[in-house]
Amino acid sequence: IVGGQEAPRSKWPWQVSLRVHGPYWMHFCGGSLIHPQWVLTAAHCVGPDVKDLAALRVQLREQHLYYQDQLLPVSRIIVHPQFYTAQIGADIALLELEEPVNVSSHVHTVTLPPASETFPPGMPCWVTGWGDVDNDERLPPPFPLKQVKVPIMENHICDAKYHLGAYTGDDVRIVRDDMLCAGNTRRDSCQGDSGGPLVCKVNGTWLQAGVVSWGEGCAQPNRPGIYTRVTYYLDWIHHYVPKKP
């Protein structure tokens, strides 16, 4: 997370850390708890070549990475069938946990938005994660969860910005309909935040608007952060994840 600050302990109870096996269980992406047994993340975190179930664990909301790990096993990794690269879209995936999480005030699910929600500019939105704090600058110990408030940008404006200084023709969309843009040169998500949630407060409820997906650098001029637009994939999500009763 570029800019922003350490998150208060009481906030973002749906935030999770994805861990890969190595010399230690290393954080590599974020995710969000959308059901007691399901985590939403980015497809590029776990695909297109899907890792072994044995190589992956989920850590629930933790103030400082690694300090009180209770890693959870995953029983299924579901990558969106249309995913190939983040830039093309469909950068969304689901992880099913072997056992449902015991929800509490500290750990609980985030609400998915209604299909009609557009998340217009001016809406109060935040992105969270344990990723880099600037380009090629790692989050330092004790690895606190960070938060930053990011401004939403309309897709057509974001697409026009991404065409500045790019070789892509103006008639070729860079920012697609299944994407959402947010951030500026002082506030952005970054490497290691991928898969994590972009949430917006709508009528008093935090809704997950996006999944950290891609961008050219972090907090670069004319290059806002790009997120997978959750509303675009609600039907796909609910094909697997039970709706709340």
Partner: antibody, heavy 119, light 106 residues
Framework: EVQLVESGGGLVQPGGSLRLSCAAS????????MVWVRQAPGKGLEWVAF????????YYADTMKGRFTISRDNSKNTLYLQMNSLRAEDTAVYYC????????????WGQGTLVTVSS | DIQMTQSPSSLSASVGDRVTITCSAS?????MYWYQQKPGKSPKPWIY???DLASGVPSRFSGSGSGTDFTLTISSLQPEDFATYYC?????????FGQGTKVEIK
């Protein structure tokens, strides 16, 4: 001592049913995913089914889906395999195994129980 | 479903020989697991996460590989190594084992 002891095997007619049990001791049974693996006479190992620590997740080999049911009773430290509509090709030694907590290999195996399906 | 193919199905070797068993997965996996089984006995865990030796396994055993191709190697075969070895993946369900490789005395 960490131990798994299977029981319930025997001779059963085709189309019949059998329930295998596996008694666990020497470890906190409720912390571990458990697996059944079988081995037909003179053949290799075949994975049968998996159950997660709290029974929320179960998976079966395709040939056993719909006929076999894996379950567990954590209060009794016991794993079960209910086998229905048995066929001659289900004849095998059935092993109960524990999935290692950290590394996902099958680190503890029972001695096995022989199931013979024959008329 | 991922299929596992071991080769050879059986091999004859002498004490002191270097022995290599291969296991090929039908699609890419991260890790391979190996088990040893002797006649009339339950299988024993032998190698996990491709190259880590299970408790009590002698250092003459090693495991390697990535993607779809993995190997178990015995640098100098000993009398107690004559057994059948099985590979297994833990990529996704259903889990599958290789058909086994029987190591026999020449």
């Amino acid at each position: 001592e960490v131990q798994l002891v299977e029981s319930g095997g025997g001779l059963v007619q085709p189309g019949g049913s059998l329930r295998l049990s596996c008694a666990a001791s020497g470890f906190t049974f409720s912390d571990y995913g458990m697996v059944w693996v079988r081995q037909a006479p003179g053949k290799g190992l075949e994975w049968v089914a998996f159950i997660s620590s709290g029974s929320s997740t179960v998976y079966y080999a395709d040939t056993m889906k719909g006929r076999f049911t894996i379950s567990r009773d954590n209060s009794k430290n016991t794993l079960y395999l209910q086998m229905n509509s048995l066929r001659a090709e289900d004849t095998a030694v059935y092993y109960c195994t524990r999935r290692n907590y950290d590394d996902r290999y099958f680190d503890v195996w029972g001695q096995g129980t022989l199931v013979t399906v024959s008329s | 479903d991922i299929q596992m193919t071991q080769s050879p199905s059986s091999l004859s070797a002498s004490v002191g020989d270097r022995v290599t068993i291969t296991c090929s997965a039908s699609s890419s996996v991260t890790y391979m697991y190996w088990y040893q089984q002797k006649p009339g006995k339950s299988p024993k865990p032998w190698i996990y996460r491709t190259s880590d030796l299970a408790s009590g396994v002698p250092s003459r055993f090693s495991g390697s590989g990535s993607g779809t191709d993995f190997t178990l190697t015995i640098s100098s075969l000993q009398p107690e190594d004559f057994a059948t070895y099985y590979c297994q993946h833990y990529h996704s369900y259903p889990l599958t084992f290789g058909q086994g490789t029987k190591v026999e005395i020449k």
